[in-house]
């Protein structure tokens, strides 16, 4: 009996060795074989000269075999799909030079810290790359100049600071990008040049709102209905446009759309972002409608009908489980891993709408339910009680503050503490007069009639970081209708650099150790987001960000970063929007 | 011309076995892809099993385990060995080519009927 | 496995006239890679094995008149006899060639009324 099952699929000998326990390559392979499945296997280390006689292989996947090393000598040159995901390769090799023809390539789910300059030098067919949930810090500039035929790109789920300029040049076929999950404070100016991207993922990076952001902003200003909001397991083609989920880190979530860049200059290069301003007319070629048939439309003109049309089986998610024995050419549609915003964690606690007012009306409350991946804890479901509009009652919580020795939970040399010793500092906060239901702690005021007025937050000056990460400063705001979020200062003992706030790719679970004292009503802003113990240096918070056109609110995960030095800058603006237990 | 001869059929008991042969003819045998298919009586055609030109096998569920293909390039023959006979597996069995790498049948013999009764 | 539904499982025709079988399959045969849909036709005369008319949904076996043709794309597919001669009697097939285990359609019997 052989050790692997053989089908066929589409002209090619397909040879499915998958969870079959091997620790080295089956020697009764056949030698035709066009498709091998290796996935879930304990092969440790692979390289291509072990499969140099299979001159007729076109996809192999390699998934989940516990991979630290790859070495790519010998040529396939018939290879078309390398699925690499799910392993512990901690460098990738030049792989242009012995696998010319792929087309598809993920590296998704590794240790991946960074990339050399020429990765994917000869890499010319490359359609699809998947290199999100790795250690990417930062983008080796050029990196994608060979692979002009780009369709798919995914960075989700990684540790980008920055990304390189023109790092999107010359990829004219580019359909879908992924970037959220990252620590990006800014888009650089003319990033995306006047490449027609469909899809674009931005949201859960800690976007910093000052001048430099401008460009960025024009951008989604003027491509709302590309900016999409990523949903487990949904087809991209069935997802909802969502400009409103790329936020401000420092301004209290607003929408960076609707950043008003007040006294920035304007900019000739922030404005006219891809060299259009004279032709008016290409403009509105691009510019969406907000009703779904215009963007159905919109996307019949720019997804290629050969790997994407509705009746391909080619999907547009990146690839995460491993194909079906009888389907390997195709990719999959859900990404495990990727940083959500839930659909069903709402809060009915308007802090920003989407045009900068705060609505009159109380909204009903709603019963929240999370749905994480199974867990023992419960989650939290308990509707916030909303109070009469025209009171501004806050939360009535008597945090006790830490022993003077024990480390502050907000400042940055952060050590592992064990959750039952990590200290939580005091919120001075008033006890509201005219309701005795306490609510969290962001006010809702009620604007007056005239204008839209809401209260500025102030902005405490940390003391001097070694490591500042934004240098731009944050302008006191003067009294005008910008819309701002009142929030009481936050004391935190003895902080002496700037706290930090970074994304986190982990599902919801209560955390019960972190837990404030019974007297405080539960409500969905003291939901925490656990990392898996292998990951013990990292804060755990929620901040909320309401959904478009509504008052609900979806929660992103949060957390520290590994290292003290590399804290990204959390402005003080977000004191109030983290979960009790946070502080 | 191309020419496809089954031989080996006949009467056989359940749990028996049974080994059909194909004799190829007015081509290059080691060049294609060969499949054996069957047909019930009055029924329609079901593929029992194929071997490619570098002489891979591959079966359906029903057959596996019970049934094995192989070829004799240097005799221009393929072969069907059936272990563990059934009534179900009464049929007329048919050889047919493929072309190239494709799974299509471009040429079929003319058939050997297996009969499996007690 | 992959299911192939034909209709009609009969078909009375007059010479002359035209004909057309379909076949659905329970998943999509199209192979995005090429743009190819993987399904086959056959025809079985009476008391005489099954001779391939078409592959590849449209391509017509060499030998095979061109009053056969086929169409269709993804699940739907459609053999058409554009005029029925009587020599085209039998049973058709269609057959995907998309992924194993192969599978082929119930037949259609056409028969002169």
């Known amino acids: 009996q052989p050790t692997c099952d053989v089908s066929k699929v589409t002209s090619l000998l397909e040879v499915n060795c998958e969870d079959k326990k091997l620790k080295k390559l089956p020697t009764d392979l056949p030698a035709d074989t066009g498709i091998l499945h290796l996935s879930k296997n304990q092969l440790g280390t692979f390289s291509t000269s072990y499969l140099v006689h299979f001159t007729h292989l076109t996809h192999l996947y390699l998934s989940r075999c516990e991979l630290t090393s790859l070495q790519a000598h010998e040529k396939l040159l018939k290879l078309e799909t390398l699925d690499l995901s799910h392993n512990h390769l901690q460098s990738l090799p030049s792989l242009g030079r012995a696998l010319p023809a792929l087309t598809t390539l993920d590296v998704s789910f590794n240790k991946l810290g960074s990339l050399s300059p020429g990765a994917l030098e000869g890499l010319g067919q490359l359609e699809e790359l998947y290199l999100q949930n790795n250690d990417l810090k930062s983008l080796p500039p050029g990196l994608l100049m060979p692979t002009t035929k780009l369709l798919k790109l995914s960075l989700a789920n990684n540790k980008l600071r920055e990304l390189p300029p023109g790092l999107l040049d010359g990829l004219e076929d580019l359909d879908t990008l992924y970037l959220q999950g990252n620590w990006l404070s800014t888009i650089p100016k003319g990033f995306f040049g006047s490449l027609l991207l469909p899809f674009v993922f931005l949201h859960a990076n800690t976007w910093y709102c000052d001048c430099e952001i401008l460009y960025f902003r024009n951008w989604l200003q003027e491509n709302p209905n590309r900016v999409y909001l990523w949903k487990e397991g949904v087809d991209v083609k069935a997802m909802t446009a969502n400009v409103a989920s790329v936020r401000c880190a420092n301004l209290g979530n607003a929408p960076v759309y609707s950043y008003p860049g007040k006294g920035c200059p304007t900019n000739e290069g922030d404005i006219d972002y891809d060299d259009y301003a004279d032709t008016p007319t290409t403009r509105t070629e691009v510019k969406f409608s907000t009703n779904t048939k215009a963007h159905t439309t919109y996307w019949g003109l720019f997804y290629s009908e050969s790997s994407t049309s509705p009746d391909s089986q080619m999907t547009s998610l990146p690839p995460i489980h491993e194909p079906t024995k009888k389907q390997p050419t195709f990719a999959h549609t859900e990404i495990p891993g990727f940083t959500t915003l839930p659909d069903t964690m709402e809060s009915n606690t308007a802090f920003y709408s989407l045009n900068n007012t705060v609505p009159t009306t109380t909204p009903e409350p709603t019963s929240t339910q999370a749905t994480p991946e199974p867990s023992s804890t419960p989650m939290l479901t308990t509707p916030v009680p909303t109070p009469e509009p025209s009171s501004i009652p806050m939360l009535t919580v008597p945090v006790s503050t830490p022993e003077p020795s024990s480390t502050p939970m907000l400042t940055t040399p952060v050590s592992t503490p064990e959750p039952s010793s990590i200290p939580m500092p005091t919120i001075p906060v008033p006890t509201p007069e005219p309701s005795s239901i306490p609510m969290p702690t962001i006010p809702v005021p009620t604007p007056e009639p005239s204008s839209t007025p809401m209260p500025t937050i102030p902005v405490p000056t940390p003391e001097p970081s070694s490591t500042p990460m934004f240098t731009t400063p944050v302008p006191t705001p003067e009294p005008s209708s910008t819309p701002m979020l009142t929030t009481p200062t936050l004391t935190t003992p003895e902080s002496s650099s700037t706290p930090s706030i970074l994304v986190s790719t982990i599902p919801p679970v209560l955390t019960t150790t972190l837990a404030p004292p019974e007297s405080i009503p539960k409500t969905v802003l003291e939901q925490f987001y656990t990392l898996e113990p292998t990951l013990p240096r990292t804060l755990e918070s929620t901040i909320i960000i309401p959904e478009q056109n509504s008052l609900n609110s979806q929660a992103v995960p949060q957390a520290s970063s590994d290292t003290p030095k590399s804290n990204p800058f959390l402005n003080s603006d977000f004191c109030c929007l983290l979960p009790l237990g946070f502080y | 011309q191309v020419q496809l001869v089954e031989s080996g059929g006949g009467l056989v008991k359940p749990g028996g076995s049974l080994r059909l042969s194909c004799a190829a003819s007015?081509?290059?045998?080691?060049?294609?892809?060969m499949s054996w298919i069957r047909q019930a009586p009055g029924k329609g055609l079901e593929w029992v099993s194929s071997?490619?030109?570098?002489?891979?096998?591959y079966y359906p569920d029903s057959v596996l385990g019970r049934f094995t293909i192989s070829r004799d390039n240097a005799k221009n023959s393929l072969y069907l060995q059936m272990n563990s006979l059934r009534a179900e597996d009464t049929a007329v069995y048919y050889c047919?080519?493929?072309?190239?790498?494709?799974?299509?049948?471009?040429?079929w013999g003319q058939g050997t009927l297996v009969t499996v009764s007690s | 496995d992959i299911v192939m539904t034909q209709s009609p499982l009969s078909l009375p025709v007059t010479p002359g006239e035209p004909a057309s079988i379909s076949c659905k399959s329970s998943?999509?045969?199209?192979?995005?890679?090429?743009?190819?849909?993987?399904l086959a036709w056959y025809l079985q005369k009476p008391g005489q094995s099954p001779q391939l008319l078409i592959y590849?949904?449209?391509t017509r076996e060499s030998g095979v008149p061109d009053r056969f043709s086929g169409s269709g794309s993804g699940t739907d597919f459609t053999l058409k006899i554009s005029r029925v001669e009587a020599e085209d009697v039998g049973v058709y097939y269609c057959?995907?060639?998309?992924?194993?285990?192969?599978?082929f359609g119930q037949g259609t019997k056409v028969e002169i009324k």
């Open positions: 047919a080519r493929s072309r190239g790498y494709e799974d299509y049948f471009d040429y």
């Open positions: 007015g081509f290059t045998f080691s060049s294609f892809a």
């Open positions: 071997i490619t030109s570098a002489g891979t096998p």
């Open positions: 998943q999509s045969l199209l192979n995005s890679r090429n743009q190819k849909n993987y």
């Open positions: 590849f949904t449209s």
């Open positions: 057959q995907q060639h998309y992924s194993s285990p192969w599978t």
